[in-house]
């Protein structure tokens, strides 16, 4: 069972937010994998990097991701006083000065080279959900998370109007 | 103003029921999990039940001492959430507290005021 | 169950003296690299008042005084310099696991 906070009915602007702290509150080095345990792997091509989600063979060493978690005052229209808190956002990368990207034109990941400051387009909040799992909004357009399509990351419209559960937004990290 | 405000409290007898009501306003209530927490007169806080989202077919979660008595259910339309609760004890006797969990699912930061329950022959 | 154990019971520090509250779980609250570890604040009469969560983020609103650390089984919640308003119960929080449990309070008073 798992749960979706960002819904398409959900109108505040992420983009809005401010991230509290240039530094991230902590870091963690772990493999990211699908609801059903498909890795999401990063492999050089043509001098760019693509993401792939796969079944990995037996004794297949699992690409790392170094995730920095920041936190971030989720703006409120619905009332002024700060009431929703504080959320937690993420930057996902599985090579040094390379993030993770939301490409809303294309409705697409990649895997782009960048300095700091980070683009808005590098940051997700992370959803905490049940089944040890998580899944990533962007930052950039609240309702769209970073899904598995075609055995690619892709973004994925999450409606909450439709009574049927999704699992291909859902992420498994693990140390191993 | 983000508001939960519950009602459905009284006195019960053992072996009766309740049903609890949790009215929700100042937010997109659909958008959020739902929780109730009791606290025994004088004691601490206990969690008691979750429910999810129409997205996830309302996927609800409960502490293991009211598993199988009480329900917990939302109705989005009325931006109401429910504890309904049967077979009641005297070790329920409580307020009982309406919670919202915070966007992205951390944790509870908007809480209602309580109704208390008194299971009492 | 993940079982929270807080101590001491209760408190009394002198206005402007630093407070300290612990709170172990019975196994490991992380996930995810993070610690799955919240702390509220319950004033007679009300419902509870997020502190931290995770372990050491500060919620909305809530003065600097107030503090969090720690990993792993023990964690611990820190008032820098207590003030008059301090005076309540102290709670911690696993949400690593359903159920969520907590510990069982820290009551803080003014010496």
């Known amino acids: 069972a798992f749960g979706i906070s960002g819904v398409q009915k959900y109108t505040r602007a992420l983009h809005d937010s401010s991230i509290t702290g240039i530094s991230p509150i902590t870091e963690y080095l772990a493999s990211l994998s699908t609801y059903n345990d498909q890795s999401i792997t990063f492999a050089l091509e043509d001098e760019s990097y693509e993401i792939y989600v796969e079944d990995l063979k037996k004794d297949e060493k699992k690409d790392k991701v170094l995730l920095s978690y920041y936190e971030s005052q989720h703006p409120s229209n619905e009332s002024g006083d700060g009431v929703d808190g504080k959320m937690l956002m993420v930057t996902l990368s599985p090579t040094k000065d390379f993030w993770l990207h939301a490409n809303n034109k294309e409705h697409s990941v990649e895997l782009h080279k960048c300095e700091k400051p980070l683009p808005d387009q590098a940051f997700f909040v992370l959803h905490n959900m049940h089944s040890n799992c998580v899944s990533f909004e962007c930052k950039t357009d609240p309702g769209v998370f970073i899904g598995v399509k075609d055995n690619h990351l892709a973004l994925i419209k999450v409606d909450s109007s439709e009574n049927l559960c999704t699992e291909n937004i859902l992420f498994k990290l693990s140390e191993t | 103003e983000v508001q939960l405000v519950e009602s459905g409290g009284g006195l019960v007898q053992p072996g009766g029921s309740l049903r609890l009501s949790c009215a929700a306003s100042?937010?997109?209530?659909?958008?959020?999990?739902m929780n109730w927490v009791r606290q025994a007169p004088g004691k601490g806080l206990e969690w008691m039940a979750e429910?999810?989202?129409?997205?996830?077919?309302?996927?609800?979660h409960y502490a293991e001492s009211v598993k199988g008595r009480f329900t917990i259910s939302r109705d989005d339309s009325k931006n109401t959430v429910y504890l309904q609760m049967n077979s009641l004890r005297a070790e329920d006797t409580a307020v009982y507290y309406c919670?919202?969990?915070?966007?992205?699912?951390?944790?509870?930061?908007?809480w209602g005021q309580g109704t208390l329950v008194t299971v009492s022959s | 169950d993940i079982v929270m154990t807080q101590s001491p019971d209760s408190l009394a520090v002198s206005l402007g003296e630093r407070a300290t509250i612990n709170c172990r779980a019975s196994e490991s609250v992380d996930k995810f690299g993070m610690s799955f570890l919240n702390w509220y604040q319950q004033k007679p009469g009300q419902p509870p008042k997020l502190l931290i969560f995770v372990a050491s983020s500060q919620g909305s609103g809530v003065p600097d005084r107030f503090s969090g650390s720690g990993s792993g089984t023990d964690f611990t919640l820190t008032i820098s310099s207590l003030q008059a308003e301090d005076v309540a119960v102290y709670y911690c929080?696993?949400?690593?696991?359903?159920?969520?449990?907590f510990g069982q309070g820290t009551k803080v008073e003014i010496k």
């Open positions: 919670a919202r969990r915070n966007y992205g699912n951390w944790y509870i930061n908007v």
């Open positions: 100042g937010f997109t209530f659909s958008n959020y999990w």
């Open positions: 929080q696993q949400s690593k696991d359903i159920p969520y449990t």
């Open positions: 429910i999810t989202l129409k997205f996830n077919a309302y996927s609800t």
